[in-house]
């Protein structure tokens, strides 16, 4: 029996050299949240505690910053950027839920070709 | 297939402790939702603890009113093992303890449907 729903951005993508807002909400449920984790594939990238506030991984300082809300935003991008990303919701009482973000970063001239191409 | 077995369980006085291990194959997920759930005689199966990990570290364990600050839900990845402590056990305990895996992470908690179970482990709390 699951309680509550985590809502996702989906899949997005953005251009390579620029930021994007991850964000998840968690609906239906009247839990209260004590903790949300980000990560990117299998690894850390930042916790926001209800208690402590943020913390962000060493290794993402500066490319990563919390916000808005309990989203994350994700700074000078590149292709190595894209994959998975997670939510991930600690809650009382009821535990743990999940969300799923997959982000493709483009070429920023794969971008710019495609605004010029132009149907005769 | 996943396999999960329990061992552990047994005769213990009221205010005793016990320590239940689950050993599991085949569940070699990134992510994992793993618990524990107890059936007292006559009565429905419940949830007890639950433990959510990831390969990028997080680690969110999540426990029943009934034993939060008593049991405590851990895991050793070494041995794919999940354990659960359980101090200061009242008769009430008595049941017998299934350790269950879920295949999806969506949600992870004691109220949450488990794909699946041991066979279970016999904990008795008399005097």
């Known amino acids: 029996m699951m309680t509550g729903t985590i809502e996702t951005t989906g899949n997005i993508s953005a251009e390579k050299g620029g930021s994007i807002i991850l964000q998840c909400h968690l609906s239906s449920t009247t839990a209260q949240v004590t903790q949300v984790n980000w990560e990117q594939q299998d690894q850390l990238l930042a916790i926001c505690n209800a208690d402590l506030g943020w913390h962000i991984s060493p290794s993402f300082k500066d490319r990563v910053a919390p916000g808005p809300g309990l989203g994350l935003t994700l700074q000078s991008l590149t292709v190595n950027d894209t994959g998975e990303y997670f939510c991930i919701y600690h809650t009382y009482p009821d535990g743990t839920y999940t969300g799923r973000i997959f982000l493709e970063v483009l070429e920023s001239s794969v971008a710019e070709h495609g605004a010029r191409f132009q149907i005769p | 297939e996943v396999q999960l077995v329990e061992s552990g369980g047994g005769l213990v006085q009221p205010g005793g402790s016990l320590r239940l291990s689950c050993a599991a194959s085949?569940?070699?997920?990134?992510?994992?939702?793993r618990g524990w759930f107890r059936q007292a005689p006559g009565k429905g199966r419940e949830g007890v603890a639950t433990l959510y990990t990831s390969s990028g570290g997080t680690y969110f364990d999540t426990y029943a009113d009934s034993v939060r600050g008593r049991f405590t839900i851990s895991r050793d990845n070494a041995k794919n093992t999940l354990y659960l402590q359980m101090n200061s056990l009242r008769p009430e305990d008595t049941a017998v303890y299934y350790c269950?895996?879920?295949?999806?992470?969506?949600?992870?908690?004691?109220?949450?449907?488990?794909?699946?179970w041991g066979q279970g482990t016999l904990v008795t709390v008399s005097s």
């Open positions: 269950a895996a879920r295949l999806s992470t969506d949600f992870c908690g004691p109220r949450a449907d488990f794909d699946y």
């Open positions: 085949g569940y070699t997920y990134s992510r994992k939702c």
